[in-house]
Interface confidence: low
């Protein structure tokens, strides 16, 4: 669900009457309106309506039973632990409950599209809200691991070796804060919309034209540039020092997170550069034009759907990339396929010495 | 400056046809939803029909569904409704109005409508 | 269908008064619209969503109301007020007028 504005979406909740007030001064009603005097108005689409009703139900149904999947093995397998958690896994921990919550909006939203929005203003409010916390929430968490990475590494700082769960709930908590204050425009302005033509109801958002832009601009560099600006930085450094101290094991210990950080750009690239497109026609510096606006908005829907698949890969990249991971998913299967059978519930002789990746020598990845 | 005019219209048998067509001018006419509107003498407002940007979707009351099409020629920057199987009911002033868009999203009102042509069904 | 019943359908004040129209859904509506009517001229918007007055409307027009009940507020009559009002809906197939409110000089 990209929670943009919809062209076919019709305005009516009455908690924005207020905000709306200012409307005729951003849109004059006046005798003396014409083309040369204001920015072209956005499109309606037609087409891009009908994209959306046929490709993201089936994709979201899909991306909602993976992530749950996924992800629920990933939280299981790091709640499994005899030991604490590392700092580094107590991200991915976070990381994990993030996506969750992320697809369980999913199918909400995949009705939205299919049909129409039949929760109410109240539930569009929750799960715009939680859709754009966790949506934050995976890029900031991912930066946080990038840094701790980076600290721990480069720096030979571990800044959360004494005390590490307070420091790292501390950080966590501070992300999640974060993340709700991005969330605030989401319980503020959507609501369930009817659209009386498509006589359907619509979750979206309902503010003017600024507003649209300034949130976009939000999402682009919160939860996209700036993590990703973290996340090369750090490992650009990280694999230098390693590179150079032809640390192989460490090598080897990083594949993993940079390999998630990979896919982190990979799947939200496109997303963020048709946003990118849609803000410079926003702002005037791309002509708007209907089949421009069409190509952007079916755009939107695919490249959208290729970020959500983010939230299923990140438990298909600890499995495939993490070794550790598939050895404690195995146990944890054991485990509870046979509760009685007291050695399978004994952790794996290297355990301890893996114990901790953000906290040994060789920085080697424990839980994952 | 926006403007709207009707033409088309005019005296009819029952059971006969009319086209009404509405020139559009003064904004991107291809980005707004159009809708025609009619009012009997001395009557109130009815809606007849509304089309999106792009000609693709189309929406009728029941009291025209079967009877009315509206349709679009953009590159004329023009509204049409082909009226058929017309009754002494339909006889009114037909408007034809504009939908305004508000932050991408169409509007169910009108923020410009025309002077309006009448069409009287009378045998 | 959602009928909107204005009242009254006649409205004799003078220059000066307060005047309240009012436009009753048959079911709750998410927002109202007024529209003001000259004789022999074309509608124009007057108040949409609710309350925000059109480009052009003077400030002593005020409209209110939620749900079932919405109001058109006039708080001093001026000769140019005197016209035929009618309030809109869209939040329920199909599209619907009032019946009117015709404001006329005392």
């Known amino acids: 669900m990209v929670l943009e504005v919809s062209d076919h979406q019709v305005l009516n909740d009455a908690e924005v009457a207020a905000l709306l007030e200012n409307f005729s001064s951003s849109y004059d009603y006046g005798e003396n309106e014409s083309d040369s005097c204001c920015t072209s108005p956005p499109c309606p689409q037609d087409f891009s309506l009908n994209f959306d009703r046929a490709f993201l139900p089936a994709l979201y149904s899909l991306l909602f039973l993976l992530g749950l999947l996924g992800n629920g093995a990933v939280a299981a397998v790091l709640l499994s632990r005899r030991t604490a958690l590392s700092s580094t896994d107590t991200f991915l921990l976070h990381l994990a409950v993030a996506d969750t919550l992320l697809v369980l909006t999913l199918p909400l939203w995949a009705v939205d599209a299919a049909v129409q929005w039949v929760f109410g203003s109240g539930l569009c409010k929750v799960a715009g809200a939680l859709f754009n916390i966790n949506f934050y929430a995976g890029a900031l968490l991912l930066a946080c691991i990038s840094f701790d990475r980076y600290l721990n590494i480069v720096h030979a700082t571990q800044l959360y070796r004494r005390g590490p769960p307070a420091r790292v709930t501390l950080t966590c908590l501070a992300v999640w804060g974060l993340c709700l204050l991005f969330a605030l425009p989401d319980f503020i302005f959507l609501s369930a919309h009817h659209d009386e033509r498509l006589n359907a109801t619509h979750c979206q958002y309902n503010f003017p034209q600024v507003g649209r832009t300034a949130l976009r601009v939000l999402q682009l560099v919160a939860g996209f540039l700036l993590p990703l600006l973290v996340m090369a930085y750090c490992y650009a450094h990280i694999l230098a020092v390693l590179l150079v101290s032809r640390g192989q094991r460490r090598l080897r210990a990083m594949r993993l997170v940079v390999v998630v950080v990979v896919a982190f750009a990979l799947c939200w690239t496109p997303y963020h550069l048709v946003v990118l497109v849609d803000i410079l026609m926003d702002l005037g510096a791309l002509a708007r034009n209907c089949g421009r606006e069409s190509r952007v908005d079916v755009a939107k829907s695919v490249t959208s759907g290729l970020g959500y698949m983010h939230c299923c890969l990140n438990p298909l990249l600890y499995a495939f990339v993490g070794v550790k991971f598939r050895e404690r998913m195995w146990m944890l299967l054991l485990r509870l396929g046979c509760p009685n059978q007291r050695g399978l519930q004994r952790q794996p002789s290297s355990s301890r010495r893996d114990s901790s990746w953000s906290e040994t020598s060789e920085a080697s990845y424990s839980g994952l | 400056e926006v403007q709207l005019l009707e033409s088309g219209g005019g005296l009819v048998q029952p059971g006969g046809s009319l086209r009404l067509s509405c020139a559009a001018s003064g904004f991107t006419f291809t980005s707004y939803a159009m809708s025609w509107v009619r009012q009997a003498p001395g009557k109130g407002l009815e809606w007849v029909a509304t089309?999106?940007?792009?000609?693709?979707?189309?929406y009728y009351p029941d009291s025209v569904k079967g009877r009315f099409t509206i349709s679009r020629d953009n590159a004329k920057n023009t509204l049409y409704l082909q009226m058929n199987s017309l009754r002494a009911e339909d006889t009114a002033v037909y408007y034809c109005a504009r939908h305004p868009i508000y932050s991408g999203n169409y509007q169910g009102y009108f923020d410009y409508w025309g002077q309006g042509t009448l069409v009287t069904v009378s045998s | 269908d959602i009928q909107l019943t204005q009242s009254p359908s006649f409205l004799s004040a003078s220059v000066g008064d307060r005047v309240t129209i009012t436009c009753r859904a048959s079911s709750g509506v998410n927002y109202l619209y007024w529209y003001q009517q000259k004789p022999g001229k074309a509608p124009k918007l007057w108040i949409y969503?609710?309350?925000t007055l059109a480009s052009g409307v003077p400030s002593r027009f005020s409209g209110s109301g939620s749900g079932n009940e919405y109001t058109l507020t006039i708080s001093s009559l001026q000769p140019e007020d005197f016209a035929t009002y009618y309030c809109q809906q869209f939040t329920s197939s199909p599209y619907t007028f009032g019946g009117g409110t015709k404001l006329e000089i005392k």
């Open positions: 969503f609710t309350s």
């Open positions: 089309i999106s940007h792009g000609g693709t979707y189309t």
